[in-house]
């Protein structure tokens, strides 16, 4: 009778993570008597996957009833496959022996490759906000995919970006891989509503790429523009001075009025108006009693935005241009939360 051969008909098997892998193996003869074992890898460090004779292998089931003497099908199924299961599997026939079973014949091996989906891309931006015209870096990371081939693209508001660098690790063979990409984005004043998108395409995703996003609202700081204006006279001795704070983001803003360099009032932006581009406008005003002043008054609107150094705008109020009422040094009526009298 011909000597037993161990046949592994599949040179390679490709399985998606989470699925069951079937590793086929048949023998050409019923003799010699002895168990079949399955190993991952070859040589002294090989890993036992299944032993027909003994042991507990909860993830492994046999395709046929291996207890039967006339069985020559030693195929197995391995459940809940993960990338860590990738490797070459060998079906090995042992001859019943003493004191130990003796390896008799091995199959040629079946390479198990595992297709694993990449994790959802995570996009992270700079730790600190930046202002328009500055270039900021965004990173995108995705892990746990196999095989190694993967495509990553960057978009800003639907427009593909070209200034980025991508690495897939490790460089050599591995059970699974990670991708890391850094893109450079130039900020504009209109970017409050903008999004940066990292898109990952992989064979396991069947044409439906994964996306990670970052809102530039978390990254951008648009500094305000200031304008101080003197409104028409409300009453004979009163002047309304306004400070228009325009086009700023984020909302966190503190305004201080200075009279000839001395703090007059400090307030925090509350009831702001939002522009279409996502930036904010705010206005503060003072009701100035000019009769309390003998000299010209320098009014300064000083704004501290989002913890940055203060910016200011001044307005010179010409006292001589207004007649003075004798003894009128009492407070003018305070008609609004943003109004203040200057004595």
């Amino acid at each position: 009778e011909e000597e037993l051969q161990v046949i592994q008909p599949d040179k390679s098997v490709l399985v998606a993570a989470g699925e069951t892998a079937t590793l086929r193996c048949t023998a050409t003869s019923l003799i010699p008597v002895g168990p079949i074992q399955w190993f991952r890898g070859a040589g002294p460090g090989r890993e036992l996957i299944y032993n027909q004779k003994e042991g507990h292998f909860p993830r492994v089931t046999t395709v046929s009833d291996l207890t039967k003497r006339n069985n020559m099908d030693f195929s197995i199924r391995i459940g809940n496959i993960t990338p860590a299961d990738a490797g070459t599997y060998y079906c090995v026939k042992f001859r019943k022996g003493s004191p130990d079973d003796v390896e008799f014949k091995s199959g040629a091996g079946t390479e198990l490759s595992v297709r694993a989906k990449p994790s959802a891309p995570v996009v992270s931006g700079p730790a600190a906000r930046a202002t328009p015209q500055h270039t900021v870096s965004f990173t995108c990371e995705s892990h746990g995919f196999s095989p190694r081939d993967i495509t990553l693209k960057w978009f800003k508001n639907g427009n593909e970006l070209s200034d980025f660098q991508t690495n897939v690790d490790p460089v050599g063979e591995s059970v699974s891989y990670s991708i890391h990409s850094t893109a450079k984005v130039v900020l504009t004043r209109e970017d409050v509503h903008s999004q940066v998108i990292c898109e990952v395409a992989h064979v396991t995703l069947q044409g439906d790429p994964l996306r990670g996003t970052a809102n530039l609202s978390e990254t951008i700081r648009v500094p305000p523009t200031l304008e101080v204006t003197q409104q028409p006279v409300r009453a004979e001795n009163q002047v309304n001075v306004t400070c228009q704070v325009r086009k700023f983001y984020p909302q966190r803003l503190q305004l201080t009025w200075l009279e000839n360099g001395n703090v007059s009032r400090t307030e925090t932006a509350s009831t702001v108006t939002e522009n279409k581009d996502g930036t904010y406008n705010w206005m503060s005003w003072l009701l100035v009693n000019v009769s309390a002043h003998r000299d010209d008054v320098k009014l300064t609107c000083q704004v501290e935005h989002d913890g940055q150094p203060a910016v200011s705008k001044s307005h010179d109020l010409k006292v001589s241009a207004h007649p003075k009422e004798q003894g009128s040094n009492t407070a003018a009526e305070n008609t609004g939360s943003n109004e203040r009298n200057i004595y």
Epitope: Q52, L66, S98, D101
Partner: antibody, heavy 118, light 107 residues
């Protein structure tokens, strides 16, 4: 139904011969190693011989040279030719199938009695 | 030849008891050990093979354990039909050899 049925037992004089048969049914006979086991009255079990799938045979020292095991796959039959019988060979003879992957006996016949006596 | 020694030779127990029979081989038999049950006038019946594998159709109250040279057969809860003689057998090396048997009797 998987079944083994022995026949051919009986009374024989010391030095005489006897041929036992075992008829197999319900399985592919040619795919299994087949064994003979005996048991003297009130005693334990003793393995007597085996014939492998490929026809290879083994015997313990107590019967070697006197007993011959054979098989006829076409007839699903196992045989034990016993020569130079002794009183110590008196026993119930069972055929058994090496039915597990490891040749463990899984199916036994009902046995046939062999008595060697003058 | 490999000698197989069973103990005890006989054992009295009651219905519901848990009993253990041991078998020792004179040399390592690589777990190729079987247990058989035999009732008077009947052929032996396979219970366990490769030391711990339950033969098809045998109830799970029977279990086998051990390795190398020392093995045990345990019956977790004796029923009337379990009272019989039990034999161990090594089938690692020709000639295959049996233990002398353990007679399990009702108390």
């Amino acid at each position: 139904e998987v079944q083994l049925v022995e026949s051919g037992g009986g009374l024989v004089q010391p030095g005489g011969s006897l041929r036992l048969s075992c008829a197999a049914s319900g399985f592919t006979f040619s795919s299994y190693d087949m064994h003979w086991v005996r048991q003297a009255t009130g005693k334990g079990l003793e393995w007597v011989s085996v014939i492998g799938i490929s026809g290879d045979t083994y015997y313990p020292g107590s019967v070697k040279g006197r007993f011959t095991i054979s098989r006829e796959n076409a007839k699903n039959s196992l045989y034990l030719q016993m020569n130079s019988l002794r009183a110590g060979d008196t026993a119930v003879y069972y055929c058994a199938r090496g039915g597990n992957w490891d040749d463990a006996f899984d199916i036994w016949g009902q046995g046939t009695m062999v008595t060697v006596s003058s | 030849d490999i000698q197989m020694t069973q103990s005890p030779s006989s054992l009295s127990a009651s219905v519901g008891d848990r009993v253990t029979i041991t078998c020792r081989a004179s040399q390592d038999i690589n777990n190729y050990l079987a247990w058989f049950q035999q009732k008077p006038g009947k052929a032996p019946k396979s219970q366990i093979y490769t030391a711990s594998s339950l033969q098809s159709g045998v109830p799970s109250k029977f279990s086998g354990s051990g390795s190398g040279t020392d093995f045990t057969l345990t019956i977790s809860s004796l029923q009337p039909e379990d009272f019989a003689t039990y034999y161990c057998q090594q089938y690692n090396t020709y000639p295959y050899t049996f233990g002398q048997g353990t007679k399990l009797e009702i108390k």
